[in-house]
């Protein structure tokens, strides 16, 4: 902590300008009024203060606002934001999307830091839900943001926000997250026609149930293998060979290359070999002819 010393004659800062980069730390502490700093925060980012000088400026703001900075100051923190701890940020009440954008810009190009994660958490909690504009902003800065949320947090995403989601935003989502997002996407895109609907829903299909996959198979969608491989195994298993053939269209030939991988491997084990042979792909491992298939899960449900 900088010790209190009197400001040398003639060095009292009348405004926040570049002359301050030549002030020693103790001179900044003694000669810069915290209230002046707060009102001229927009200038700080344009001035190449040293990292140690930024520590002094932060200290002055902390003394002026022990309960947390007002949004008028937060919006103009610029590089000073990088000096903030998650504990500092938890004291803030950030309501403006412009403030959020300004601070995310400072951290642009870097991994999401604990400070940014705390800031986003404060912002979203303050809003009550992840609205479209917020989601737009967050995924623009952090494409993986959506997949960093828990299924419980994702449940607060309104279906209207799903329009902001791009395919790459879902790259790292696991099945539990897609289970939450898929019904929202289905609702959001429900008024689109067949081919347009499929383009939009495709990225979310890792959360689709069997009945929806069956419905898609009737619409000539030509699902690619990459999408098929991301489907829930339990949703794929009940599909018939004919349904999978219709679902994949010309891409059905790709099953051969994936026959040892889930969900294709498990699906093959559930199909009659006769039916698999109709595909002409040489898929092996189906149920031999003459065998009776007992659906034990159905039996358990009845007993």
């Amino acid at each position: 902590e900088v010790e209190k010393t009197a400001c040398p004659s003639g060095k009292k800062a009348r405004e926040i300008d570049e002359s301050l980069i030549f002030y020693k730390k103790w001179e900044l502490e003694a000669c810069v009024d915290a209230a002046l700093l707060a009102t001229q925060m927009d200038r700080v980012n344009a001035i190449p203060f040293t990292y140690e000088q930024l520590d002094v400026l932060k200290h002055k703001l902390d003394e002026l606002y022990p309960q947390g900075y007002p949004e008028s100051v937060i919006q103009h923190l610029g590089y000073l934001f990088l000096k903030m701890s998650p504990e500092d940020i938890r004291k803030w009440n950030v309501t403006s999307l412009e403030t959020l954008k300004a601070l995310l810009e400072v951290n642009k190009g870097h991994e999401m830091s604990p400070q940014v994660a705390t800031l986003i958490d404060r912002f979203v909690k303050g809003r009550g839900q992840l609205d479209k504009d917020t989601l737009d902003t967050l995924t623009a800065f952090y494409p993986g943001y959506l997949c960093s949320l828990s299924p419980e947090e994702l449940s607060s995403v309104p279906p209207s926000s799903i329009w902001a989601v791009r395919p790459q935003d879902l790259d790292t989502c696991d099945p539990r997250q897609l289970d939450v997002l898929y019904p929202k996407a289905r609702l959001a895109f429900q008024n689109m026609n067949g081919s347009e609907y499929f383009v939009k829903i495709q990225s979310f299909l890792g959360g689709a149930p069997t009945e929806d996959l069956k419905a898609l198979s009737q619409q000539n969608v030509s699902m690619d293998l990459a999408t098929f491989m991301k489907l829930r195994t339990d949703a794929v298993l009940p599909l018939t060979v004919a349904e999978v053939q219709k679902l994949l269209g010309p891409h059905v030939e790709g099953l051969k290359a994936e026959e040892r991988h889930r969900p294709v491997r498990d699906w093959i084990l559930r199909q009659r070999q006769d039916d698999l042979d109709t595909l002409g792909l040489g898929l092996q491992g189906g149920i031999p002819n003459g065998y009776l298939v007992l659906d034990l899960s159905m039996q358990e449900a009845l007993s």
């Epitope: 980069i21 030549f22 190449p48 930024l54």
Partner: nanobody, 124 residues
Amino acid sequence: EVQLVESGGGLVQPGGSLRLSCAASGLIFSTNAMGWFRQAPGKGRELVAAISWRGGYTYYPDSVEGRFTISRDNAKRMVYLQMNSLRAEDTAVYYCAAGTARIDYLSQDGYNYWGQGTQVTVSS
């Protein structure tokens, strides 16, 4: 990278004047501050003047305040040091330096690009 070349040094009598020039090239727009340092035989480098590259704000230590003036011409990418009322103790090699890192601009730590230096000798 920033390249710096000093000129204008020489022999001058006590009480006389000299004007040093520093030509900067390369990524000069990334510079935060420019400084003139000097190093007398057997001594460490000391800052004698600094100027903020964008705003043109200046700094001088007490030893040269009122005698030395630093200035810059951004368009020409030049930094100057006007030295008046020179004394024997001003004899040293004078270096031009550019600081692009956000580190102490009042010490040599804050300057990561340096010229080769120009000799200034004050003697009768």
